[in-house]
Interface confidence: low
């Protein structure tokens, strides 16, 4: 006769492991007992359980409550056992020894492999700011047995680097994602993808990128200087910028205080009916926690009466 078993039995942490051992004998042969032992190299064989044809199942105190026979119906030539709730320490070599009558004793070995699915964690790098060079955006670490695979899924351009640390029964893998921060990356997802044979599907952890920036400031409203004449109503200057965090705006006049009647409404400077008093240099100051920007414009309010007077003088001079 001969023993039928598996070279390797693979289970996920916490699952039940079936350790197969079936004696395929000639007609009339009987199995008297099946002994299961832990048979790791460098250690003496530690008995796990013994199935006796008359006295039933015996379990070592070290495995009490964790070793069972498969549910009925049972074949008397089947010496398989169930190891409940496999833990990482169960991983290793096992030996099945079958005592038969009249053929004698047979033995076979198998390896139990316990997969430990990873529990990944994602940690963001330092605050991202536009203008930085290559910067750590996030690192993702996963520990398991065997070593998990850690990759990144994102539309953001960047570089990855991985390192692995081997422990006695597992391995930790850390992957870092570096990028050169730009404002276009704001709000973009950066997803760590962890693959492992103990997982039914990849584990994905998403981090949303936040990149601080402040765009150059500019002022709109002076495109047509001829509109800035005495008496004009509804004249306004608007400061243009954008940033993350969203910026605040402040208006000042370089050559003195803001004239009375001029209204500041966030990014907009509203003027009452224009007079020559409104001529001057106006500064828009844009700032957020990241940076600040200034933009200044010169307002020159035209007085038609002054202009016509000048023209008359010129004519008379000729």
């Amino acid at each position: 006769g001969e023993l039928e078993t598996s070279d390797v039995v693979t289970v996920v942490l916490g699952q039940d492991a079936k350790l197969p051992c079936f004696y395929r004998g000639d007609s009339g042969e009987q199995v008297g007992q099946v002994a299961w032992a832990r048979a790791d190299a460098g250690e003496g064989a530690q008995e796990l359980a013994l199935l006796h044809s008359k006295y039933g199942l015996h379990v070592s105190p070290a495995y009490e409550g964790r070793v069972e026979q498969p549910p009925p119906p049972r074949n008397p030539l089947d010496g398989s056992v169930l190891l409940r709730n496999a833990v990482q320490a169960d991983e290793g070599e096992y030996e099945c020894r079958v005592s038969t009558f009249p053929a004698g004793s047979f033995q076979a070995r198998l390896r139990l492999r316990v997969l430990v699915p990873p529990l990944p964690s994602l940690n963001p790098g330092p605050a991202l700011e536009e203008g930085q060079g290559l910067t750590l955006a996030a690192s993702c670490t996963a520990e398991g047995s065997p070593a998990p695979s850690v990759t990144w899924d994102t539309e953001v351009k960047g570089t990855t680097s991985s390192r692995s640390f081997k422990h006695s029964r597992s391995a930790a893998v850390t992957s870092e994602f570096h990028l050169v921060p730009s404002r276009s990356m704001n709000g973009q997802p950066l997803t760590c993808v962890v693959s492992h044979p103990g997982l039914l599907q990849d584990q994905r952890i998403t981090h949303i990128l936040h990149v601080s920036f402040l765009a150059e400031a500019s002022v709109r409203g002076l495109e047509d200087q001829n509109l800035w004449h005495v008496g004009r109503e509804g004249a306004m200057l608007k400061c243009l910028s954008e940033g993350q965090p969203p910026p605040s705006y402040n208006w000042t006049r370089l050559d003195g205080p803001l004239p009375s009647g001029v209204r500041v409404d966030g990014d907009t400077l509203g003027f009452p009916p224009l007079t020559t008093e409104h001529s001057g240099i106006y500064v828009c100051h844009v700032s957020n926690e990241f940076s600040s920007r200034d933009s200044q414009v010169t307002v020159d309010v035209l007085d038609p009466q002054e202009d016509s007077g000048k023209q008359v003088d010129l004519v008379s001079a000729s």
């Epitope: 529990l119 964690s121 994602l122 940690n123 963001p124 996030a138 952890i205 981090h207 949303i208």
Partner: nanobody, 122 residues
Framework: QVQLVESGGGLVQPGGSLRLSCAAS????????MGWYRQAPGKQRELVAT???????NYADSVKGRFTISRDNANNTVYLQMNTLKPEDTAVYYC????????????????WGQGTLVTVSS
């Protein structure tokens, strides 16, 4: 690992109401912030509202006064009551959650649900 399952989406007329629910399961002992994002066709995903375990809330300007987020910590469930719905609220709504790690350190691990579609149309 945390699993998030949304429900309550559907078709509603402008001005109508819907209530979305999101139940968390799995490794949920340390869920910190829960909330909702949405993504309209052809647009980027945007924050709608979030709520801490202590009940502090955050709303996008576009939904303030119309949407109300609430949370049942005992059942690890977050709700989004949406009133006075507008066509521009049409989007896939995603539940999100993060967790507190050991020693109370915030882990920026963000978990997402599969999304539930809200369509506002007459």
């Amino acid at each position: 690992q945390v699993q998030l399952v949304e429900s309550g989406g559907g078709l509603v007329q402008p001005g109508g109401s819907l209530r979305l629910s999101c139940a968390a399961s799995g490794s949920i002992f340390s869920i910190n912030v829960m909330g909702w994002y949405r993504q309209a066709p052809g647009k980027q995903r945007e924050l709608v509202a979030t709520i801490t375990s202590g009940g502090s809330v955050n709303y996008a300007d576009s939904v303030k006064g119309r949407f109300t987020i609430s949370r049942d910590n005992a059942n690890n469930t977050v709700y989004l009551q949406m009133n006075t719905l507008k066509p521009e609220d049409t989007a896939v709504y995603y539940c999100t959650a993060d967790q507190l790690g050991p020693l109370g350190l915030l882990s920026p691990t963000i978990y997402w649900g599969q999304g539930t579609l809200v369509t506002v149309s007459s």
